[in-house]
């Protein structure tokens, strides 16, 4: 499956963009997010490439200090209650417990911004992606992957964090965007939506896929998150959308046929070992590029997104399993974990392969419109 | 086809016990939560207590919480729920029920017949 | 909890109508609904789930509709074996709860 690039491909033809949206980002949702007073509640502190691993995933990822960009993981947020949007607004609600844990959701008050300055930034993510904006970058070279073939033993973490199910990484998981840009993985977690609800972060086109990965690593100029939080490329994650198909995925199948001893907040297994590739698209070399934020508090920016253009197939089935079986805190069910999508204020994403050239018939004149920037450096 | 059949309620005095037994077949029991739902003469439905595909989360409705326990064993394809310290509001005709997912907290697809307990000096 | 009112809780209507039964939640549900049909001394039968689906083996004539917190069940046209209490059901939210009941009487 490829994203869509044509309009016939894209189920909501051109949509609203972030790019034209000219409401700050975290005050207010973009018109094609505004939650709807119909929509059920989503109830998600959202998750996570901004949950990062705690000092018991990676020993070297220690805080130094409370300042902002300084961060452990206990103040990162975690989720306390249902919102209303089907599309959850950029707003959260803060509470002090006895850990200090900072407590929010998503269509609840105060604004994130209060919750983490970081939040009211002019680069947020997620984006909604327009192919035919995109600026092709042909030094943008394949994806490079290596030790992410694990064997069952030692076995990893499975966890219900409230926001999300997440799955920490063991050392030694590297990936290159390219040459001098190294990269160690840290955990995966997954964003989704609920029954007959899509709930990826990112859309194409405004269309939103039913579900999202994240593979969130750290630069190997940094030795702790802390130190590489809202250092532009400090972070990358690599995200991938989730789609139905006809057959069961079984790479999938060896995390989601866990997720009931999961199934509360808080809780957690201990699961084989997989090959975490092969959770990701196989083709490594298309993907749009672009840099954003983490898409929670503390919302930190400058890390490097790279989105796939292919997407994953799962069954209907699966894809029920992971919006049904997990709850989040009180008695609400864990759905609808993403964040709406946030205006581009003039980033452009670039793209491996030409992703504005459309084969189809009604389109002969290729649209690109941006240049490439960077050209992948 | 899909059977599910109840066993072992009865007449019993408040503060008695009582354990009933709900014996599957036609499908792959392992792969399915299961619940317990009871009716009080004459009354509607109330969810009492699930188990999930598994056995590995219990939930309880608050009016029973404490007092029963939900269990499965998957290599006998049977479900349980040991009821404690019975009121005579327990009385009621309790089925068991598949829901239509490993999770418990689902729609039941299948309902057995039903077993009736009794609670009363 | 979320409470599930259901309305009418009875009705009387003759073989060959429609009748519409409606259930309302105290908050959003989705379309995490089911209705069943019970008959006296008999267990519940599940007709529809996710507020749309039909149960396999449940004759078309029967069909539901909503989403959020407004849900009905519609029997196009009904027949003689129809006549039978119905009940809704959330399972949204914990603890999964039922509606109180229609029963529909013939006319």
């Known amino acids: 499956q490829r994203l869509p690039r044509m309009q016939e491909d894209s189920p909501l033809g051109g949509g609203s963009s972030g790019e034209d949206d000219p409401l700050g980002e975290e005050d207010l949702p973009s018109e094609e997010d505004s939650p709807r007073e119909e929509d059920p509640p989503g109830e998600e502190d959202l998750p996570g490439e901004e949950d990062l691993p705690g000092e018991e995933d990676l020993p070297e990822v220690k805080p130094k200090s409370e300042e902002e960009g300084s961060l452990k993981l206990e103040d990162l947020p975690t989720v306390e209650a249902p919102g209303d949007p089907q599309e959850p607004q950029n707003n959260a609600h803060r509470d002090k417990e006895g850990d200090d844990q900072s407590h929010w959701r998503y269509g609840g008050d105060p604004p994130w911004p209060r919750v983490s300055p970081a939040c009211a930034g002019r680069f947020q993510s997620p984006v909604d992606i327009r192919p035919q904006l995109a600026a092709f970058c042909p030094a943008l070279r394949p994806l490079e992957l290596l030790g992410f073939q694990l064997p069952p033993l030692p076995e990893l973490r499975l966890r219900n964090n409230g926001h999300s199910v997440q799955l920490t990484l063991p050392p030694g998981l590297e990936m290159a965007l390219g040459p001098g840009r190294e990269y160690r993985a840290l955990q995966l977690h997954l964003h989704w939506g609920a029954a007959g609800r899509p709930g990826s972060e990112h859309t194409v086109e405004g269309h939103r896929f039913p579900a999202e990965i994240h593979v969130v690593h750290l630069s190997t100029a940094f030795a702790r998150v802390d130190e590489a939080l809202g250092r532009p490329g400090g972070l990358a994650v690599l995200a991938a959308f989730l789609e139905e198909g006809p057959e069961e995925n079984s790479a999938y199948e060896q995390l989601l046929s866990r997720l009931e001893e999961i199934a509360e907040e808080g809780s957690e297994t201990q699961v084989p070992g997989l090959d975490i590739s092969a959770l990701l698209p196989s083709d490594f070399s298309r993907y749009f590029q672009y840099e954003g934020s983490l898409t929670t508090p503390p919302c930190a920016q400058g890390v490097i997104w790279t989105v796939f253009n292919q997407t994953v197939m799962l069954s209907a089935k699966q894809l029920h399993t992971l919006s049904d079986t997990l709850w989040g805190p009180g008695d609400s069910r864990l759905q609808l974990n993403f964040r709406a999508t946030q205006p581009l204020n003039g980033r452009v994403i670039e793209a491996s392969f030409p992703a504005g050239v459309d084969s189809s018939p009604r389109a002969a004149e290729p649209v690109q419109l941006n240049s490439c920037l960077a050209a992948g450096d | 086809q899909v059977e599910l059949v109840e066993s072992g309620g009865g007449l019993v005095q408040p503060g008695g016990s009582l354990r009933l037994s709900c014996a599957a077949s036609?499908?792959?029991?392992?792969?399915?939560?299961m619940s317990w739902v009871r009716q009080a003469p004459g009354k509607g439905l109330e969810w009492v207590s699930g188990?999930?595909?598994?056995?590995?989360?219990?939930y309880y409705a608050d009016s029973v919480k404490g007092r029963f326990t939900i269990s499965r064993d998957n290599s006998k394809n049977t479900l349980y729920l040991q009821m404690n310290s019975l009121r005579a509001e327990d009385t009621a005709v309790y089925y068991c029920?598949?829901?239509?997912?490993?999770?418990?907290?689902?729609?039941?697809?299948?309902w057995g017949q039903g077993t009736l307990v009794t609670v009363s000096s | 909890d979320i409470q599930m009112t259901q309305s009418p809780s009875s009705l009387s209507a003759s073989v060959g109508d429609r009748v519409t039964i409606t259930c309302r939640a105290s908050?959003?549900?989705?379309?995490?609904l089911s209705w069943y049909q019970q008959k006296p001394g008999k267990a519940p039968k599940l007709l529809i789930y996710?507020?749309?689906n039909l149960q396999s083996g449940v004759p078309s004539r029967f069909s539901g509709s909503g989403s959020g917190t407004d849900f009905t069940l519609t029997i196009s046209s009904l027949q003689p074996e129809d006549f039978a209490v119905y009940y809704c059901?959330?399972?949204?939210?914990?603890?999964?709860?039922f509606g109180q009941g229609t029963k529909v009487e013939i006319k």
């Open positions: 029920a598949r829901t239509g997912s490993p999770g418990t907290f689902m729609h039941g697809d299948h």
């Open positions: 996710g507020a749309s």
């Open positions: 188990i999930s595909s598994l056995g590995s989360t219990t």
């Open positions: 059901q959330q399972y949204y939210g914990r603890p999964t709860t």
């Open positions: 036609g499908f792959t029991f392992s792969s399915y939560g």
């Open positions: 908050q959003d549900i989705n379309n995490y």
